[in-house]
């Protein structure tokens, strides 16, 4: 798999899509997990509605939400309030019972915020020893929830 | 109506290669998996691989990796099974089935008995 | 791999009777996430190719008559065939499918006595 980059601004939101074969991937629920080291295991950070018809309602799992359109094949995983510590590698993930195949893999990194004059020198970007050289990257163009903007549909 | 028709049966010597298929029909070929299965002469089933034509994405069992090649053409709605180099235990009839994305197999072919004898 | 066990080896059964045959995995099979148990049954019928009967523990496969019911929890599972008839005879496997790669128990033969 290549990796294909996404580029967010601290702070505001990161909008992440992962498009697949519908068919080829009917009926599985989806998962974002985080890469831990180049070798190491990918730690589930959100999954998908455990009723895969309910797919499409949108799960949070603190600043990370994932929804999914499985007619159209596209996972749609946004975080919130984009900081430095969230970026690095991760993988969208299509799960049959206890496997999980990867869809893409994802490497997220955070930009300075321009309007932000602080000291931008604890923001990651992949080092020497983290090149990918067949990366492809999007930048997402983002913005911050407006005040008082709910971020997901009320229980009632 | 859907179908799976598998060719027909082989007689081998061990050393020889061969190649079986199994070709699908009634429905959208490339869109879903397609597995293929052991039945030893009066034994169980054993699953051995599972391949998704529209992009030939393939996974296979340990047990049958490194030992079959499991292949597919999209434009003749056509899977494959191969072997490079035939063994005595080889002997079996070997079945194809449609798989949904959570494999399991909702049709079946007929079968293709290969036998492998000196 | 994850073992499938079944049992009895071979059922004989008279017309109108309820058969019962188990079949047991080495590990548990209900993902604990989306509740689903990943066992299925299939029916092979003497000089056939397999059939799917059950699917996901309890669900019946397309034209399944409702006598085939599936049960279990976890590592231990029943499929029951209710007032069997003569076209019921032939081996009954189960499947597993929550991890690759996917086993089949030994199979059990149901005959009419």
């Known amino acids: 798999h290549n990796t294909t980059v996404f580029q967010g601004v601290a702070g505001q939101s990161l909008q992440v899509s992962c498009p697949y074969d519908s068919m080829k991937h009917w009926g599985r629920r989806k998962a974002w997990c985080r890469q831990l080291g180049e070798k190491g295991p990918c730690q589930r950070v959100v999954s998908t509605h455990n009723l895969w018809l309910l797919s499409f309602l949108r799960r949070w799992n603190g600043s990370t939400a994932i929804t999914d359109d499985t007619l159209g094949g596209t996972l749609t995983i946004t975080l919130r309030n984009l900081q430095p510590h969230d970026a690095g590698l991760y993988q969208c993930q299509s799960l049959h019972g206890s496997e999980a195949d990867t869809l893409r893999k994802v490497l997220v990194e955070v930009l300075a915020d321009p309007l932000d004059h602080r000291d931008a020198g604890d923001l990651w970007f992949p080092g020497e020893s983290e090149s990918f050289e067949d990366a492809h990257v999007e930048h997402s163009i983002s913005r911050s929830l407006l005040e008082g903007e709910i971020p997901f549909p009320p229980t009632s | 109506e859907v179908q799976l028709v598998q060719s027909g049966s082989e007689v081998k010597k061990p050393g020889e290669s061969l190649r079986i298929s199994c070709k699908g029909s009634?429905?959208?070929?490339?869109?879903?998996?397609l597995a293929w299965v052991r039945q030893m002469p009066g034994k169980g089933l054993e699953w051995m691989g599972i391949?998704?034509?529209?992009?030939?994405?393939?996974r296979y069992s340990p047990s049958f990796q490194g030992q079959v090649t499991i292949s597919a053409d999209k434009s003749i709605s056509t899977a494959y099974l191969q072997w490079s180099s035939l063994k005595a235990s080889d002997t079996a009839m070997y079945y194809c089935?449609?798989?949904?994305?959570?494999?399991?197999?909702?049709?079946w072919g007929q079968g293709t008995l290969v036998t492998v004898s000196s | 791999d994850i073992v499938m066990t079944q049992t009895p080896l071979s059922l004989p059964v008279t017309p109108g009777e309820t058969a019962s045959i188990s079949c047991r995995s080495s590990?548990?099979?209900?993902?604990?996430?989306?509740?689903?148990?990943?066992l299925d049954w299939y029916l092979q019928k003497p000089g056939q190719s397999p059939q799917l009967l059950i699917y996901?523990?309890?669900y019946r496969a397309s034209g399944v008559p409702d006598r085939f019911s599936g049960s279990g929890s976890g590592t231990d599972f029943t499929l029951k065939i209710s007032r069997v008839e003569a076209e019921d005879v032939g081996v009954y496997y189960c499947?597993?499918?929550?991890?690759?790669?996917?086993?089949f128990g030994g199979g059990t033969k149901v005959e009419i006595k």
């Open positions: 391949i998704y034509p529209g992009d030939s994405d393939t």
């Open positions: 499947m597993q499918r929550i991890e690759s790669p996917l086993t």
């Open positions: 996901t523990l309890s």
């Open positions: 590990q548990s099979l209900l993902d604990s996430e989306d509740g689903n148990t990943y």
């Open positions: 009634g429905y959208s070929f490339s869109s879903y998996w």
């Open positions: 089935a449609r798989g949904t994305p959570l494999f399991y197999f909702t049709y």
